[in-house]
Interface confidence: low
């Protein structure tokens, strides 16, 4: 009679995480008598997966009834597959011996590959806000997927970005993988309402990629522009001067009026108006009693926005000739150093 062969007909099996894997194995003969065992891996470090003779293997069920005398089907099912189950499984026939059974013949092995979905991408932006024309970095991370092949794309408001670097770890074989990508995004004035999207496509997602988003409203700071104007005289000896604070984001803003360098009033932006692009406008006014001043008055509107160095704009109020019409603005004065050297 022909010598027993152990046949594993499937070279490889691909299973999605959470599902059940069927590993097929048949013997060509009932002789010699002895049990079947399943192992993951080969050599001395192999891991016992199922032993027909003894042991408790809660995730493993047999396809056939192995207690029947004429059974030659030793296929098994492994439930609730995870990426950690990936590997090559061997069906091994043992010959009955004393005191121990002796390994007789092994099948060629079946490689179990596990398809595991990537986790939802998490996008994180810079710790500090930046102003338009700066480039900021965003990172995107997703974990636990298998196989290794994966595609990651970045978008800003639906437009694909090209300036990014992506790594998939580990480089070698692993039960599951992680992806990490860093994209550079240039901020523009209109980005308060913008979104950065990281899109991950993987075989397990069946064409429906996962997306992670970050709102640039959490990243951008749009500094205000200031305009100081003198309104027509409201009453004898009283002049109304307004400071228009335009196009700023976020809302956190404190304004200080100075008369000839002395603090007159400080207030915090409250009733702001929102522009279409998401930035804010605000207006503050100061009623100046001209008769209280013998000389010309320098009025300064000083704004501290989002904890940044104050910017200011001044207006010269002529006391000698009581102004009846709008005065002119002087150039903006930046109280903080505006020059940036990088060496």
């Amino acid at each position: 009679e022909e010598e027993l062969q152990v046949i594993q007909p499937d070279k490889s099996v691909l299973v999605a995480a959470g599902e059940t894997a069927t590993l097929r194995c048949t013997a060509t003969s009932l002789i010699p008598v002895g049990p079947i065992q399943w192992f993951r891996g080969a050599g001395p470090g192999r891991e016992l997966i199922y032993n027909q003779k003894e042991g408790h293997f809660p995730r493993v069920t047999t396809v056939s009834d192995l207690t029947k005398r004429n059974n030659m089907d030793f296929s098994i099912r492994i439930g609730n597959i995870t990426p950690a189950d990936a590997g090559t499984y061997y069906c091994v026939k043992f010959r009955k011996g004393s005191p121990d059974d002796v390994e007789f013949k092994s099948g060629a092995g079946t490689e179990l590959s596990v398809r595991a979905k990537p986790s939802a991408p998490v996008v994180s932006g810079p710790a500090a806000r930046a102003t338009p024309q700066h480039t900021v970095s965003f990172t995107c991370e997703s974990h636990g997927f298998s196989p290794r092949d994966i595609t990651l794309k970045w978008f800003k408001n639906g437009n694909e970005l090209s300036d990014f670097q992506t790594n998939v770890d580990p480089v070698g074989e692993s039960v599951s993988y992680s992806i990490h990508s860093t994209a550079k995004v240039v901020l523009t004035r209109e980005d308060v309402h913008s979104q950065v999207i990281c899109e991950v496509a993987h075989v397990t997602l069946q064409g429906d990629p996962l997306r992670g988003t970050a709102n640039l409203s959490e990243t951008i700071r749009v500094p205000p522009t200031l305009e100081v104007t003198q309104q027509p005289v409201r009453a004898e000896n009283q002049v109304n001067v307004t400071c228009q604070v335009r196009k700023f984001y976020p809302q956190r803003l404190q304004l200080t009026w100075l008369e000839n360098g002395n603090v007159s009033r400080t207030e915090t932006a409250s009733t702001v108006t929102e522009n279409k692009d998401g930035t804010y406008n605000w207006m503050s006014w100061l009623l100046v009693n001209v008769s209280a001043h013998r000389d010309d008055v320098k009025l300064t509107c000083q704004v501290e926005h989002d904890g940044q160095p104050a910017v200011s704009k001044s207006h010269d109020l002529k006391v000698s000739a009581h102004p009846k019409e709008q005065g002119s603005n002087t150039a903006a004065e930046n109280t903080g150093s505006n020059e940036r050297n990088i060496y």
Partner: antibody, heavy 123, light 107 residues
Amino acid sequence: QIQLVQSGSELKKPGASVKVSCRARGYTLTDYAMNWVRQAPGQGLEWMGFINTYTGEPTYAQGFKGRFVFSLDTSVSTAYLQIGSLKAEDTAVYYCARTRGYYDFDGGAFDYWGQGTLVTVSS
Amino acid sequence: DIQMTQSPSSLSASVGDRVTITCRASQNVGTHLAWYQQKPGKAPKSLIYSAIYRYIGVPSRFSGSGSGTDFTLTISSLQPEDFATYFCQQYNTYPLTFDQGTKLEIK
């Protein structure tokens, strides 16, 4: 059509100053940072620095601090390069070049260039 | 400062030739590398950014490759208008630096 239009050639004496202009056409000046690049006769290109056209914040390369000033007049969509106390070695073609922004750590590639302004310093 | 070195410094070729210009950075610049073309008396023209991306309007015969320290500009089939000087520029680290250029001449 996007263009950077620079002012014409200048002949100056040592010690004088010069102001080169670069007008942005076909786009909003304040949406893109502006670089300045020098090319001495028969030489390569040398990056001088850039100005953040939104905030007006200039950044100067090491050899261009002090006598060189970058400025803007957004009302006429123009960036300026002013050089003071001119020396013979300042003789060069000066280019403005636009970049889509600048990187805090990575600089930027230039997509549009001005036609160049030749500044000659000679006694 | 990062030094950029291009080779060769000059190159003679004929119309229709395939030409390769290499650029080496003294340290890793990732893919933050650009290529420019300059003709005598003219401003530079931007060809390639991020090592491999062509600007709109740049003919497909121009292609860039490389990352880290070694980069290549390839012109697949030289046209008469391609004879010029080619510069590479790194924009990974301040100060932004250019190489001295490769002059491409008619053989």
